[in-house]
Interface confidence: medium
Amino acid sequence: MQKGDQNPQIAAHVISEASSKTTSVLQWAEKGYYTMSNNLVTLENGKQLTVKRQGLYYIYAQVTFCSNREASSQAPFIASLCLKSPGRFERILLRAANTHSSAKPCGQQSIHLGGVFELQPGASVFVNVTDPSQVSHGTGFTSFGLLKL
Amino acid sequence: MQKGDQNPQIAAHVISEASSKTTSVLQWAEKGYYTMSNNLVTLENGKQLTVKRQGLYYIYAQVTFCSNREASSQAPFIASLCLKSPGRFERILLRAANTHSSAKPCGQQSIHLGGVFELQPGASVFVNVTDPSQVSHGTGFTSFGLLKL
Amino acid sequence: MQKGDQNPQIAAHVISEASSKTTSVLQWAEKGYYTMSNNLVTLENGKQLTVKRQGLYYIYAQVTFCSNREASSQAPFIASLCLKSPGRFERILLRAANTHSSAKPCGQQSIHLGGVFELQPGASVFVNVTDPSQVSHGTGFTSFGLLKL
């Protein structure tokens, strides 16, 4: 998209990783058919994509989860794409919500988030979910990425 | 996105086509408000988008389907975005799953898949679903495309 | 994506706005973490994104809604991405459908639409839904945007 040394392509696509951590922030890995164009975008601590260059980015995430209405809280399953910029609080960029299924033992559903946002140098984006234990980590089900316009 | 003769824009958006074939691979057509930027991306056999140039591509698919829990298998409806590169096995890039609805005669649901992937010259991408007979082919409901970064 | 004066970046991301209007066309605002790259794309009347330059655009929308099967019509909730080009009728580019939830008082669900389309100078895109009163306007839930390739 950006050609030559001045404008190298900047893009990433990382794959979900099951985690024993109790945090609501999803974990990712450079595994399988992942993309990491160069060091102008990096996966930090397995949880956030951090960019070195300011600019407009299309950022996306897909989360597949399996839940059951009776076994879950009344609140829906929510996936949030969040931004942490240097010198600023975290903020929500995008959210999607799906009510839990009545299927047993659980019903699978997929959420897709995506949008164009201005990122500052050093900005990080990450994905939060209401219940990480419900996330599906089978091949291709849950992923996260970005591309610089 | 890529300007000049060296870097022509490469993009495609194709429209779902009902098929009598029993294959799980969805069929597509250059009809309606479709996009086919040039011959650097082609729709082959109505089933796969094939690219001539190596590079990073944002690939996406949207599938709307109508299913009923009682009339369907217990397994969810799954849509898969798959890659076939020359000299390599097929592989799954992305998947999404939705449990069948209890609505009668069937309940409509939509799935969206999208991600950034490196494609080799001659690579093809296609979309698989668990039950093609459940796919909705009304205007705009089911489509497939890509753009080269 | 497009560098230099000849090819400025063109991108927009706007945020849903609750409206007292009875129209099925969703309302948007330049608020929160919105994007409006320059005057080559504008938000008109709070309802449509209008572009000044011809070209290929990736256009997307995300709609989160809360509905209940008993309280809603039998027809599913449908979100449509529509195009109005100068001198042409409106046309549907993309649609997604989700059957209403049985959750009470209502069950949240999210829809994502996205695709690559050729737009003419002065073309406008907008989002229609079957029942705007069911749309969720909390931070990040419902948004609309585009980027020029």
Epitope: T23, S24, V25, A75, K84, G87, R88, F89, E90, R91, N128 | - | I15, K31, G32, Y33, G138, T139
Partner: antibody, heavy 120, light 107 residues
Amino acid sequence: EVQLLESGGGLVQPGGSLRLSCAASGFTFSKYAMNWVRQAPGKGLEWVSAISGSGESTYYADSVKGRFTISRDNSKNTLYLQMNSLRAEDTAVYYCARAHDYDSMLMDYWGQGTLVTVSS
Amino acid sequence: DIQMTQSPSSLSASVGDRVTITCRASQSISRYLNWYQQKPGKAPKLLIYAESTLQSGVPSRFSGSGSGTDFTLTISSLQPEDFATYYCQQSYTIPLTFGQGTKVEIK
């Protein structure tokens, strides 16, 4: 209706500690970042600290860094401010404030405040 | 830290007057400027955010403008309930900082 109710203020000696609480109701507490802002008698507003909705990220003004700790218990819909090594200049009315939906760095609802007096 | 400077520090006005308060940031803060109203013994109340967006429930006689470093709060026709202290706040970067306040008194 959004309500924020601070408690825990009082008179404390320099070097002492105090724990402020803010009970929240009328909104989904865990979805919002929360702030503490203070106002010395007859003076203006000073931001003290903030915490993300999940509680995983915290932020402090330089004047309180290392002495104050912000935390939250989302199961109890309660925000806390643990204040240690208190100084005379910490004397103020302490407000808890909810972060705005569209920009977490501004505040749309405030409690009525609790007075902290640091004096010997 | 970004310093926020309000002027005037206080002003006297009558009901029906048009009142303007200015706020200057020590560096550009884009449109990340917010205004609060505080009455004696009460908590602050958000009036305007993102430079010009009226908070829900705030009367339309309040308006905000500006960008970069210079911002203005205008009350088009002062009402009795508007006599209060007004604070600007930048939400551009941590630490969040407020102006010193402008007290609007009855003439």
